[in-house]
């Protein structure tokens, strides 16, 4: 029996679903009762999924596999693998037996894109031409191992004095850290390119270093006292201003934005021009307003990881600096309500009501109420689970003994946005049935 699979490996991104194609040619009069289909790991012979005795025997592989049952009779024995993990990488054998039998193996190549590199410089202050600095290029959560290339501002390769290390994280994805040691010239741009060899995906990072003259005295730099609140995915303006003296020209200005804690360069304007973003290419200055003393920074597509303090450093002849805080926020989704058990309920039964609200930031506060609006505090367990982006999914579980009928409401509050999202479940009747209701979120004042 001829079994056909693709010659090339199937490439699947971590977290997505993959189809391992396999087909055979059924003879006229073929029926599924005759078919034995077995998918197994080629090396270990571990069973993955099977169809025997005329029916799907189900997944033997972490409940993440499925057959295309409606296509089996036409000879499509392909396997769907859900939520691909690094550990799934390898060879899968498709074994088909009718009267004759045949088998073929298909390779699964798992991949994950690398993040935009973050660049750090050490030391990062009081730099002079001729100083030796260490530039670290870090890119996260990719697979398989990355290739890293360094270039100067002219695009010429920098090969000397580079040490590249790959660190596997808890999921088996790789963080790559490449360290370049270089002697500073008058100024220079250093770029690193992180390549995923399977996806042929390149992620670029660069840093421009301008050694400073020795400043003296003080420039008054003003920033807002209160944190700037920004929604995930939106753009934020970190306001910063200084008072230019008469006759001030941009050629005199050194403006540096950096992360307060780590001193990582975020954006700079030196030598009369914008040196660009050193922060994942998501920052910009208001160049047409700089001459009037507006040194504000625009941060695009805000992420949870951006939260923290940013320092605005202004040097003309004198210098000054001030720090502005960024508070990141994301609204919680309308809660979904589930009830367990959810049939044949009687008054006096103990049930578990779960209220789940997704992708918010920072952590939520959850409140439960009965139909009269009275708080329900006993037997509540609330868990916050951070997802890949650092946003939180909140799951609050209420255990309650049913009365004759009742409404149970949960309120999920975002403490920064003062946003409330409501969900409720009503349990009525004999035997009791339930209906879940969701309310659009609103802002609480």
């Amino acid at each position: 029996l001829e079994v056909q699979v693709p010659e090339d490996p199937v490439v699947a991104l971590v977290g997505t679903d993959a189809t391992l194609r396999c087909s055979f040619s059924p003879e006229p009069g073929f029926s599924l009762a005759q078919l034995n289909l077995i998918w197994q790991l080629t090396d270990t012979k571990q069973l993955v999924h099977s169809f025997t005795e005329g029916r799907d025997q189900g997944s033997a592989y972490a409940n993440r596999t499925a057959l295309f049952l409606d296509l089996l009779a036409q000879g499509n024995a392909s396997l769907r693998l859900q939520r691909v993990r690094v550990a799934d990488e390898g060879s899968f054998t498709c074994f088909v037996s009718i009267r004759d039998f045949g088998s073929a193996a298909v390779s699964l190549q798992v991949a994950a894109p690398y993040s935009k590199p973050s660049m750090t410089l050490e030391p990062n202050k009081d730099l002079r031409p001729g100083d030796t600095v260490t530039i670290t290029c870090s890119s996260y959560r990719g697979y398989p191992e990355a290739e890293v290339f360094w270039q100067d501002g002219q695009g010429a390769p920098l090969t000397g004095n580079v040490t590249t290390s790959q660190m596997a994280n808890e999921q088996g994805l790789f963080d790559v850290h490449s360290v370049l040691r270089v002697v500073l010239g008058a100024n220079g741009t250093y770029s690193c390119l992180v390549r995923n060899p399977v996806l042929q995906q390149d992620a670029h990072g660069s840093i421009t270093i301008t050694p400073q003259r020795s400043p003296t005295g003080a420039v008054e730099v003003q920033v807002p006292e209160d944190p700037v609140v920004a929604l995930v995915g939106t753009d934020a303006t970190l306001r910063c201003s200084f008072s230019p003296e008469p006759g001030f020209s941009l050629a005199q200005l050194n403006l540096i934005w950096q992360l307060t804690d780590t001193k990582q360069l975020v954006h700079s304007f030196t030598e009369g021009r914008d040196q660009g973003s050193a922060y994942a290419n998501r920052t910009a200055l208001f160049l047409d307003l700089l001459a009037q003393g507006n040194a504000s920074l625009r941060l695009q597509r805000v992420r949870v990881a951006d939260e923290g303090s940013f320092t605005c450093f202004v040097s003309i002849r004198d210098f000054g600096s001030a720090a502005v805080s960024l508070q990141v926020a994301a609204p919680y989704s309308k809660p979904s309500m589930t009830l367990e058990p959810n049939k044949d309920l009687r008054p006096g039964d103990t049930v578990t009501i779960t209220c789940s609200s997704y992708r918010g930031y920072p952590e939520a506060e959850v409140f439960w109420q009965d139909g009269q609006g009275a708080p329900l505090t006993g037997n509540v367990t609330t868990s916050q689970m951070a997802n890949e982006q650092g946003l939180f999914d909140v799951h609050s579980v209420l255990r309650v003994v049913l009365g004759a009928n009742g409404t149970y409401s949960c309120l999920v509050r975002n403490p920064v946005l003062q946003q409330d999202a409501h969900g409720s479940v009503t349990i009525t009747g004999q035997p009791m049935t339930f209906a879940a209701a969701h309310h659009h979120h609103h802002h609480h004042h």
Partner: antibody, heavy 117, light 111 residues
Framework: EVKLVESGGGLVQPGGSLKLSCAAS????????MSWVRQTPEKRLEWVAS???????YYPDSMKGRFTISRDNARNILYLQMSSLKSEDTAMYYC???????????WGQGTLVTVSA | DIVLTQSPASLAVSLGQRATISCRAS??????????MHWYQQKPGQPPKLLIY???NLESGVPARFSGSGSGTDFTLNIHPVEEEDAATYYC?????????FGGGTKLEIK
Amino acid sequence: EVKLVESGGGLVQPGGSLKLSCAASGFTFSSYIMSWVRQTPEKRLEWVASIVSSNITYYPDSMKGRFTISRDNARNILYLQMSSLKSEDTAMYYCARSGTRAWFAYWGQGTLVTVSA
Amino acid sequence: DIVLTQSPASLAVSLGQRATISCRASKSVSTSAYSYMHWYQQKPGQPPKLLIYLASNLESGVPARFSGSGSGTDFTLNIHPVEEEDAATYYCQHSRELPYTFGGGTKLEIK
């Protein structure tokens, strides 16, 4: 010649703190990931922490929060700040230079930490 | 966490014979590119010393009588021919995912 010399070990009471140091020489310190590994009295080896640069660190869950790894590239020194120490933290603590895929290529002679009342 | 189980816990081998130490991982520590398993030797009063990295690569300065093999979950350190100075405890370590863990050690005695 790569040389790693640990110091700062000693006797400390449960709940106490200690800061270990490791002086490195014979290689370009700032270019390498550095790590701490400990060996218990039963001779079990346990990875404690690794540091890429001042803001990039790795720990096992069991050490997070209590232990902080840091480095001073100007002085070629690696540190391990340990707090809320428990008797289970009693061990020989080794400083190690990590290889490019998280093996431990060079080790110091170790410094002994004893946590006991 | 990936658990590494070494066997035997101790063994005695005659001078000039082969010593074989096994390390089994609770899940695969290999990718299509590399096996993230490393071997160390430790003598009393000394720190561990790297012998083999990435399953089969001999560290610079380590004698060629040491060799490593294996992939996936099963790895082996071979010493042949065994010499007097090889009496030590041998450890395996993986770096496939956090946290990086070590095996419990195998003590080699020379008869």
